[in-house]
């Protein structure tokens, strides 16, 4: 027979020879890091077919690291379901707890013994320091010094000293999150008041109010013979400006009797089309309304702004 087979878990006792005679026996032993569990054979014989009798290293078992218990409020998860050396142990904490120590330990061979690469971690309860204080507002549980996981606080604004109330900008409720960090930034309390939205040749049709505070929503429509340039719905944003800007109502041009003239694309910026808070520089685009919205009217010629009554 030629050289005997080699194995992952066991090695030949003695030096291998170039060839062996029929009937000759070779013995194996478990490699370092493996140990023998009877009764499987760990030897083989060169048979008369010039082949080695079947043998396997199934009798040699990997050394295993000591059993690790689940950490309190967490779990120890063996990577391949095994504690054998060369493998990893992963640690995870239950919701509301965080890991102190190594998230992964390695089962390593020290001499002929398998040991873990470090100490098992522990799971500590997630705790948050008190959330931020805000100007012109307060939060619930302001007397509490330590907050546990998912504990929530709700912010509210103080009464305003003037005629206009403080608006709460942002989410009113935040909670103590995963990494001992609050779920989001604290909201802000400030006076938000948008100007009265003036639309020439049009009028407000909903969202009427004495004053327009944060998130106030207003809708407009144009007078007959005018079309809306901009959005028909605007919302008072946190900067006390209308978003999108207050629209304009532009005149629908009468039908021309013959073929239309070439357009010059110059914009007549008649001051009568101005409305408050329309401070964007440069002329605003003029949109052609769909014809179907204005039966009996043609499309307006682009670039002509005219808002005479």
């Amino acid at each position: 027979c030629e050289e005997p087979p080699t194995f992952e878990a066991m090695e030949l006792i003695g030096k291998p020879k170039p060839y062996y005679e029929i009937g000759e026996r070779v013995d194996y032993k478990c490699k370092k890091g493996y140990f023998y569990i009877p009764p499987l054979a760990t030897h083989t014989i060169c048979d008369r077919n010039h082949t080695w009798l079947p043998v396997s290293d199934d009798a040699c078992y990997r050394e295993t690291c000591p059993y690790i218990r689940d950490p309190l409020n967490g779990q120890a998860v063996p990577a391949n379901g095994t504690y054998e050396f060369g493998y990893q142990m992963h640690f995870i904490c239950n919701e509301g707890y965080y890991l102190i120590g190594e998230e992964i330990l390695y089962c390593e061979l020290k001499g002929s013994v398998a040991i873990w690469s470090g100490k098992p971690p522990i799971c500590e309860k997630v705790l948050c320091t008190p959330p931020p204080k805000i100007k012109n507002g307060k939060h619930t549980f302001s007397e509490v010094e330590v907050f546990e996981y998912l504990d929530a606080v709700t912010y509210s604004c103080d009464p305003a000293p003037g005629p206009d109330p403080f608006s709460l900008i942002g989410e009113s409720t935040i909670y103590c999150g995963d990494n001992s960090v609050w779920s989001r930034a604290a909201p802000e309390c400030k006076v938000v008041k948008c100007r009265f939205p003036v639309v020439e040749n049009g009028k407000q049709i909903s969202g009427f109010g004495k004053k327009f505070y944060y998130k106030a929503t207003v809708m407009f429509e144009c007078d007959k013979g005018f079309y809306l340039d901009g959005s028909d719905t605007i919302v008072c944003d946190s900067n006390s400006t209308w978003d999108p800007p207050v629209p304009k109502c532009l005149k629908v041009l009468p039908p021309s009797s013959t073929k239309p003239p070439a357009l010059s694309h110059s914009v007549s910026t008649s001051s009568t089309t101005k409305s408050p808070a329309s401070s964007a520089s440069g002329p605003r685009p003029t949109y052609k309304p769909p014809v179907s919205n204005y039966p009996g009217y043609p499309k307006p010629e682009e670039g002509i702004l005219d808002s005479l009554d």
Epitope: R195, T272, P276, A277
Partner: antibody, heavy 118, light 107 residues
Framework: EVQLVESGGGLVQPGGSLRLSCAAS????????ISWIRQSPSRGLEWLGV???????NYNSAFMSRFTISRDDSKNTAYLQMNSLKTEDTAVYYC????????????WGQGTLVTVSS | AIQLTQSPSSLSASVGDRVTITCRAS??????LNWYLQKPGQSPQLLIY???SLHEGVPDRFSGSGSGTDFTLKISRVEAEDVGVYYC?????????FGQGTKVEIK
């Protein structure tokens, strides 16, 4: 608190022109929306137009072709330019600060009298 | 333009009387209506804004109500200093317009 004082009124012939001034003290004219309103026994109170803080204007269409509102920030003054004056333009003219961006007229001055007569 | 019609055009009341002035709009104006008082020899002064909100410094004997097209100004107990001409003003639509006025006298 800003005070607005009207001036420039007087006697003018029909077809003539006149420029009224509205001077601000105790504040900047550009920080406020300023309306012009007039009052006459025959026509009562009439809103003429407004100049907004951003410089934009809106007019009463009945006067738009003859009246123009402007502002000179360096002089801290708003103006009402009136052209082609008619006898029915005889009135007391007020400049008025629009209340905090809302069309409520809470700050009336004493007004300036314009008389259009030949 | 939206027309505002006030009634009565004038009235005479005794001190302590309850006075009611109405203002009717030619089309719906929601609550976008203000009231002014012009005392003899003075400029107008704002009394009430947005139909019913008292301007600062205005006595609470003044009250406003209404919505849409019909509005009312009430003086619960009229006083001598309340004489003058009362005007309503709408601001839902340009041009902003005023009523023709209601003259209030004390008997």
């Amino acid at each position: 608190e800003v005070q607005l004082v009207e001036s420039g009124g007087g006697l003018v012939q029909p077809g003539g022109s006149l420029r009224l001034s509205c001077a601000a003290s105790g504040g900047s004219v550009s920080s406020y929306d300023i309306s012009w309103i007039r009052q006459s026994p025959s026509r009562g109170l009439e809103w003429l137009g407004v100049i907004w803080t951003d410089g934009g204007t809106n007019y009463n269409s009945a006067f738009m072709s003859r009246f123009t509102i402007s502002r000179d920030d360096s002089k801290n003054t708003a103006y009402l330019q009136m052209n082609s004056l008619k006898t029915e333009d005889t009135a007391v003219y007020y400049c008025e600060r629009v209340y905090d961006g809302y069309p409520w007229f809470a700050y009336w001055g004493q007004g300036t009298l314009v008389t259009v007569s030949s | 333009a939206i027309q505002l019609t006030q009634s009565p055009s004038s009235l005479s009341a005794s001190v302590g009387d309850r006075v009611t002035i109405t203002c009717r709009a030619s089309q719906g104006i929601s609550n976008y209506l203000n009231w002014y008082l012009q005392k003899p020899g003075q400029s107008p002064q704002l009394l009430i804004y947005y139909t019913s909100s008292l301007h600062e410094g205005v006595p609470d004997r003044f009250s406003g109500s209404g919505s849409g097209t019909d509005f009312t100004l009430k003086i619960s107990r009229v006083e001598a200093e309340d004489v003058g001409v009362y005007y309503c003003q709408q601001y839902i639509k340009l041009p902003w317009t005023f009523g023709q006025g209601t003259k209030v006298e004390i008997k």
